[in-house]
């Protein structure tokens, strides 16, 4: 029950996180005009990954796309790439995790397959979240650098009578959305990975007990098999996900308290 809850919660948290990453990527407010200690203008500038916008006090807003690839800063291109990779990985992760959910039964999918898929989606969510956090952080760093450069420019070269106003940009709403969304996706991924361990318990739980003649000592690989949970008439032992990766040589059966029935 706890495993199902952890897996379900991980899925929901990741879903919210990826929706947030998509929203942040599409938002225009990655950087907004800094209003602090600046002359008050009747025009407000803000920029996104894909276009820059200007909102006049009347409410009229005009946005212009960046209709160039080569002319854009490499850092902006890198941020775009990180966000897109994050979205793609997150979307694939969501798709995989839907089939991995314990509460959803698809044909006769084994628990081992579900465990593998849960782990895969968890890793994808973690990487997706890290991509988003990295992308937003790179952009934020770029803003901080430019902010102090433009601040320095504001106080130099003002010998003439005519003053020029340097538009400075600060953190926009999209950055905070991106950080939170990336964090949620990361947390969701960790929860999926935790749930994966629960889907593959170390000990074997028997519901259908098989009896053997005393002369036959049937050795099972510890934790490697699990008796059927009793759906349908299938009472054969099923191989489930084995937490530790082992080589062929290592797969030997040593006597344990679980070996004999």
């Amino acid at each position: 029950m706890a495993v199902t809850a952890c897996q379900g919660l991980g899925f929901v948290v990741s879903l919210i996180g990826i929706a947030g990453i998509i929203a942040a990527t599409c938002m225009d407010q990655w950087s907004t005009q800094d209003l602090y200690n600046n002359p008050v203008t009747a025009v407000f500038n803000y920029q996104g990954l894909w276009r820059s916008c200007v909102r006049e006090s009347s409410g009229f807003t005009e946005c212009r796309g960046y209709f160039t690839l080569l002319g854009l800063p490499a850092m902006l291109q890198a941020v775009r790439a990180l966000m897109i990779v994050g979205i793609v990985l997150g979307a694939i992760g969501l798709l995989v995790s839907i089939f991995a959910l314990k509460c959803i039964r698809i044909g006769s999918m084994e628990d081992s397959a579900k465990a593998n898929m849960t782990l895969t989606s968890g890793i994808m969510f973690i990487v997706s979240g890290l991509c988003a956090i990295a992308g937003v952080s790179v952009f934020a760093n770029m803003l901080v650098t430019n902010f102090w450069m433009s601040t320095a420019n504001m106080y130099t070269g003002m010998g003439g009578m005519v003053q020029t106003v340097q538009t400075r940009y600060t953190f926009g709403a999209a950055l905070f959305v991106g950080w939170v969304a990336g964090g949620l996706t990361l947390i969701g991924g960790v929860m999926m990975c935790i749930a994966c361990r629960g889907l593959a318990p170390e000990e074997t739980n028997y519901k259908a007990v098989s009896y053997h003649a005393s002369g036959h000592s049937v050795a099972y690989k510890p934790g490697g098999f699990k008796a059927s949970t009793g759906f349908g008439s299938n009472t054969k032992n099923k191989k489930i996900y084995d937490g530790g990766a082992r080589t062929e040589d290592e797969v030997q059966s040593y006597p344990s308290k679980h070996d004999y029935v």
Epitope: T41, A42, N45, V54, E56, S58, G59, E62, R64, T167
Partner: antibody, heavy 118, light 113 residues
């Protein structure tokens, strides 16, 4: 069509508060802002302030301590209050609609003459 | 506050001739975000309220004759009337529409020579 009409007392005593109303028609108060401008006799234009569609206001820094601009959407009216008036406040007072783009003033009222005198 | 300086104070031009009015602002009116200059030109005829002619320094308001054109960027702007007509006799004002408080130039009185 778009129309703006200023109204108010033509004569105000010094130190009193000047109250003017701008009644508008032909446009939505939730879409357009309104500016107040004045013009002393034989002189140039002086911007007093603006109230934007969202309700935010901006004022001339020289008049900020004395001026208040407000809106009554139910009556389609904008109002200007200027306190502690002096003879220097004698002027023709205009209200004008804020253009949707360019921050210009695209429609103007005919103006109302206000004289400050005892 | 932004200071708008117009020149000349008055101008006399013959009918059909070109009239040029200059306006200088104490700070740039160019917005880097959209590369537009927030300068507006108005025409005020005697006994009438001002009329919007040009916004964004060079965009003509609808209904304004083509002979009126605006140019310039940053801090220096020009209003040009390509061929002066009798009905163009008026006072012309430039306005800072970028920084609060919005400020007007002192005006240029245009007359016929």
């Amino acid at each position: 069509q778009v129309q703006l009409q200023e109204s108010g007392p033509g004569l105000v005593k010094p130190s009193e508060t000047l109250s003017l109303t701008c009644t508008v028609s032909g446009f939505s108060l939730t879409t357009y802002g309104v500016h107040w401008i004045r013009q002393p006799p034989g002189k140039g234009l002086e911007w007093i302030g603006v109230i934007w569609a969202g309700g935010s206001t901006n004022y001339n820094s020289a008049l900020m301590s004395r001026v208040t601009i407000s809106v009554d959407t139910s009556k389609n009216q904008f109002s200007l209050k200027l306190s502690s008036v002096t003879a220097a406040d004698t002027a023709v007072y205009y209200c004008a609609r804020a253009a949707y783009y360019g921050n210009g003033l695209d429609y103007w009222g005919q103006g109302t003459m206000v004289t400050v005198s005892s | 506050d932004i200071v708008m300086t117009q020149s000349p104070d008055s101008l006399a031009v013959s009918l059909g001739e070109r009239a040029t009015i200059n306006c200088k602002s104490s700070q740039t009116l160019l917005n880097s975000g959209n590369q537009k200059n927030y300068l507006t030109w108005y025409q005020q005829k005697p006994g009438q309220p001002p009329k919007l002619l040009i916004y964004w320094a060079s965009t003509g308001e609808s209904g304004v004759p083509d002979r009126f054109s605006g140019s310039g960027s940053g801090t220096d702007f020009t209003l040009t009337i390509s061929s002066l007509q009798a009905e163009d006799v008026a006072v012309y004002y430039c306005q800072n529409a970028y920084f609060y408080p919005f400020t007007f130039g002192g005006g240029t009185k245009l007359e016929i020579k």
